[in-house]
């Protein structure tokens, strides 16, 4: 049991894409406010989003310090206007989140095809290396920097005149594929982390087709 008219947060959920990480919970507060704490398994608790009436808290700055760590968060509930008040056990009411390991669980954002270039019967397709909020030496790392060879891309490509999707794979951000001369092709890419058990695939990139402005053609 907690303080009068204060309810514990519930449905604590991590929402994370390319390491941008937000903790969400319910309920919308009525006469109460929340404070969030986050910690690694072996670390100290750090408070964030003090006495907020929001039902989400951006924890990106904390988890990007080490994306391979496992984090736990907790949400404290306080009566509005009386944040010093505690529950019957002498401390505020709180609820724990599920554990969260960013490297293993962050969703892969929708990739983007940066460019494609045809030279004869070969096409080079390049995937944009998206920047993340993970830092090293004061610079933001790209998705490839963070995941290395764990991250692969699947290219789906097809003749504009047909529906069957051929596939190619790369653990860089470039594909070199064979195409039939004189045919226009369309492309879509998907990011994949095969070593994962959850959140293995991204959504597909927007489709790009030859004959549009992203492409170049050389004999």
């Amino acid at each position: 049991s907690g303080t009068t008219n204060t309810v514990a947060a519930y449905n604590l959920t991590w929402k994370s894409t390319n390491f941008k990480t937000i903790l969400e919970w319910e309920p919308k507060p009525v006469n109460q406010v929340y404070t969030v704490q986050i910690s690694t398994k072996s670390g100290d608790w750090k408070s964030k989003c003090f006495y907020t009436t929001d039902t989400e808290c951006d924890l990106t700055d904390e988890i990007v310090k080490d994306v391979k760590q496992t984090y736990l968060a907790r949400v404290f509930s306080y009566p509005a206007g009386n944040v010093e008040s505690t529950g019957s056990a002498g401390e505020p009411l709180y609820e724990n989140s599920p554990e969260f390991t960013p490297y293993l669980e962050t969703n892969l954002g929708q990739p983007t095809i940066q460019s494609f270039e045809q030279v004869g019967t070969k096409v080079n397709v390049t995937v944009e290396d998206e920047r993340t909020l993970v830092r090293r030496n004061n610079t933001f790392l790209s998705l490839r920097d963070v995941f290395g060879k764990d991250l692969i891309y699947t290219l789906y490509y097809w003749k504009s005149s047909s529906s069957g999707k051929k596939t190619a794979k790369t653990n860089t951000n470039e594909f070199l594929i064979d195409v039939d001369k004189g045919e226009n092709y369309c492309f879509s890419v998907q990011a994949v982390i095969p070593s994962r058990t959850v959140n293995r695939k991204s959504t597909d990139s927007p489709v790009e087709c030859m004959g549009q402005e992203k492409g170049e053609f050389r004999e």
């Epitope: 060879k149 692969i152 069957g164 051929k166 794979k169 790369t170 653990n171 998907q190 293995r200």
Partner: antibody, heavy 121, light 107 residues
Framework: EVQLVESGGGLVQPGGSLRLSCAAS????????IHWVRQAPGKGLEWVGY????????YYADSVKGRFTISADTSKNTAYLQMNSLRAEDTAVYYC??????????????WGQGTLVTVSS | DIQMTQSPSSLSASVGDRVTITCRAS??????VAWYQQKPGKAPKLLIY???FLYSGVPSRFSGSRSGTDFTLTISSLQPEDFATYYC?????????FGQGTKVEIK
């Protein structure tokens, strides 16, 4: 435990249709790729086609293109092979298989038990 | 399409023998080759992936290697349960293609 179970095989007349199912358990099909492979009596393995259940993308062997359609229902965790305009040469045991990657190299780690399709008048 | 030419189509061997099966790809497939074992009336089972990696639970007497576009499956000491048909397969491009199979029989 990961399992694939095919069903729907049987005897069908030339020109007829049949729908095979591949029910998956122990994993989510949307996170993988599903292939269909067939084996005529006494013959080797022949690839039929694949689907990426997360986006519905498919590709087919030339021998079945225009006649066979692969689909998937992620809510049922099941892939399907719709076979139309069946011919005697489509007689085979049909397998579904789960594809995964080791870095960029694909492999098919789980296969169904197979279901026999016989096309005969 | 990439052709996978597998040889021999069949072989007879005794328990304890060293057995080698080869597959030649018609063009470069990098390491995107897998080997499968199939017994009569059963589904194929994965043995080797990425040309040389032993799949989980497969006995260590099985091994795979690559030299350019030539791929080899070796059984170092044939056991009674190894009498079966073996297939190579490339996944480098769509469509994936299988070798014709090698039937390993008891001498």
């Amino acid at each position: 435990e990961v399992q694939l179970v095919e069903s729907g095989g049987g005897l069908v007349q030339p020109g007829g249709s049949l729908r095979l199912s591949c029910a998956a358990s122990g994993f989510t099909i949307g996170s993988y790729w599903i292939h269909w492979v067939r084996q005529a009596p006494g013959k080797g393995l022949e690839w039929v086609g694949y689907i990426d259940p997360s986006n519905g993308y498919t590709y087919y062997a030339d021998s079945v293109k225009g006649r066979f359609t692969i689909s998937a229902d992620t809510s049922k965790n099941t892939a399907y092979l719709q076979m139309n305009s069946l011919r005697a040469e489509d007689t085979a045991v049909y397998y579904c298989a789960r594809a995964d990657y080791y870095y960029v190299d694909e492999y098919w780690d789980y296969w169904g038990q197979g279901t026999l399709v016989t096309v005969s008048s | 399409d990439i052709q996978m030419t597998q040889s021999p189509s069949s072989l007879s061997a005794s328990v304890g023998d060293r057995v080698t099966i080869t597959c030649r790809a018609s063009q470069d497939v990098n390491t995107a080759v897998a080997w499968y074992q199939q017994k009569p009336g059963k589904a194929p089972k994965l043995l080797i992936y990425s040309a040389s990696f032993l799949y989980s639970g497969v006995p260590s007497r099985f091994s795979g290697s690559r030299s350019g576009t030539d791929f080899t499956l070796t059984i170092s000491s044939l056991q009674p349960e190894d009498f079966a048909t073996y297939y190579c397969q490339q996944h480098y491009t769509t469509p994936p293609t299988f070798g014709q199979g090698t039937k390993v029989e008891i001498k």
